[in-house]
């Protein structure tokens, strides 16, 4: 997260760290007792490593009463996701057991109504991604509030030049932005999960390159079919 600040500890009980061989790789969001939603591209970076999900965390390194590390039983990328595109960049991870829900671990309701979020709406994005262009990684969860950007502006030739489909949404990126390591994390508007940070190699913090988020409402049928 660029231009953000440390989040209030455990105030986002849905927040997940998708880890490979014990290292944070991507963000994720708990959407059901046994399921975490993340970005499909995250798996590409996992290679043959052991994928696990950390829940109930604020600090990645310090022991915390609410932290639990879960093995992954099954990884389900969206069937249409591809390495060379950010289209359909969603991944569902089934935990090896149901997460024990409590004050620091709770699923987040996700948007099912397939309607664009009003441009200008302030949404919260959180993650353990880099906090500087030098690549400094935070130990504690960061967050930032970002205004939603209308798709037409986002698709300008000077911005993303038509790459933003109806199944994506954008948020402003003027010094405040999601970045490398935040991929798969939640964009939350009005207490509801609206978007998932895409995992392309986009430049961060440049207002001409807005943040791109996969709209979960557009994938409600797929999410429901996997969770069923």
């Amino acid at each position: 997260i660029l231009g953000g600040r440390e989040a209030e500890a455990h105030a986002r009980p849905y927040m997940a760290s998708v880890q490979v061989n014990g290292e944070h790789l991507c963000g994720g969001v708990l959407v059901a007792e046994q399921w975490v939603l993340s970005a499909a591209h995250c798996l590409e970076d996992a290679a043959d490593g052991k994928v696990q999900v950390l829940l109930g965390a604020h600090s990645l390194s310090q022991p915390e009463p609410s932290k639990r590390l879960y093995d992954v039983l099954r990884a389900v990328p969206h069937p249409d996701s591809r390495p060379d595109t950010i289209d359909h960049d969603l991944l569902l991870l089934q935990l090896s057991e149901k997460a024990t829900l409590g004050p620091a671990v709770r699923p987040l309701p996700w948007q099912r109504v397939d309607r664009d979020v009003e441009p200008g709406t302030l949404c919260d994005v959180a993650g353990w991604g880099i906090v500087s262009h030098a690549g400094r990684r935070p130990d504690r969860l960061q967050h930032v509030l970002l205004p939603v950007l209308d798709r037409a502006t986002c698709n300008r030739r000077t911005h993303h030049d038509g790459a933003i489909t109806q199944r994506m949404m954008c948020a402003e990126s003027n010094r405040r932005d999601s970045c490398k390591g935040d991929s798969g994390g939640p964009l939350v508007c009005g207490g509801v999960l609206e978007g998932v940070v895409t995992s392309g190699s986009r430049v961060c913090g440049n207002r001409k390159k807005p943040g791109i988020y996969t709209r979960v409402a557009s994938y409600a049928a797929w999410i429901d079919s996997v969770l069923a």
Epitope: A9, P63, E64, P65, S66, G102, P103, A104, R106
Partner: antibody, heavy 118, light 107 residues
Framework: QVQLQQPGTELVKPGASVKLPCKAS????????MQWVKQRPGQGLEWIGE????????NYNQKFKGKATLTVDTSSTTAYMQLSSLTSEDSAVYYC???????????WGQGTTLTVSS | DIQMTQTTSSLSVSLGDRVTISCRAS??????LNWYQQKPDGTVKLLIY???RLHSGVPSRFSGSGSGTDYSLTISNLEPEDIATYYC?????????FGGGTKLEIK
């Protein structure tokens, strides 16, 4: 300051039901879970269950499913535990306690002594 | 369910003593353990959470330690107000369970 107020005693007849209140004050009620704990006379503590007042999600101890029902009234910042089909085995002190992200109960009510007797 | 055993149900102590109360879990609970104090009037207070972390406002004479299945609470210099019953509680696996309690009594 944080307070959890419980009535001191309740006397009910066998077979009846009772709804024990726990009035919370001094903090944002929906920001903390509430736990309920039973203590039989001269015995130890037994966890009954816990409820999230923000959306009424509940974790129950299987042993108390069907016996205890946890609810909240956010408008009055009160948590309730209803106990049904009461027998002498239900005679005990019942505590409510605020449950936090440190995974511990940091404030406890004074307890309600429930006596089931004809 | 995970069984929590406090083998010593009562302990005769003197003021100023260093007192150690032990607690054993029926399986590894990986430090997911709290300690509570219950006064004779029934008042319950959190002392230690996550095995060794002192809850705010709790005197520093209280400390906790342990790992795996074996845990302990130590009171370094017993004060009159410490006369109470002490309970360990695990939160590794639902349902959360308490030990049977250890009651401190003045010799």
């Amino acid at each position: 300051q944080v307070q959890l107020q419980q009535p001191g005693t309740e006397l009910v007849k066998p077979g009846a039901s009772v709804k024990l209140p726990c009035k919370a004050s001094g903090y944002t009620f929906t920001s903390y879970w509430m736990q309920w704990v039973k203590q039989r006379p001269g015995q130890g503590l037994e966890w009954i269950g816990e409820i999230d007042p923000s959306d009424t999600y509940i974790n129950y101890n299987q042993k108390f499913k069907g016996k205890a029902t946890l609810t909240v009234d956010t408008s009055s910042t009160t948590a309730y535990m209803q106990l049904s089909s009461l027998t002498s085995e239900d005679s005990a002190v019942y505590y409510c306690a605020r449950y936090t992200t440190i995974m511990a109960s940091d404030y406890w009510g004074q307890g309600t002594t429930l006596t089931v007797s004809s | 369910d995970i069984q929590m055993t406090q083998t010593t149900s009562s302990l005769s102590v003197s003021l100023g003593d260093r007192v150690t109360i032990s607690c054993r879990a029926s399986q590894d609970i990986t430090n997911y353990l709290n300690w509570y104090q219950q006064k004779p009037d029934g008042t319950v207070k959190l002392l230690i959470y996550f095995t060794s972390r002192l809850h705010s406002g709790v005197p520093s004479r209280f400390s906790g330690s342990g790992s795996g299945t074996d845990y302990s609470l130590t009171i370094s210099n017993l004060e009159p107000e410490d006369i109470a019953t002490y309970y360990c509680q695990q939160y590794s696996k639902l349902p959360w369970t308490f030990g049977g309690g250890t009651k401190l009594e003045i010799k």
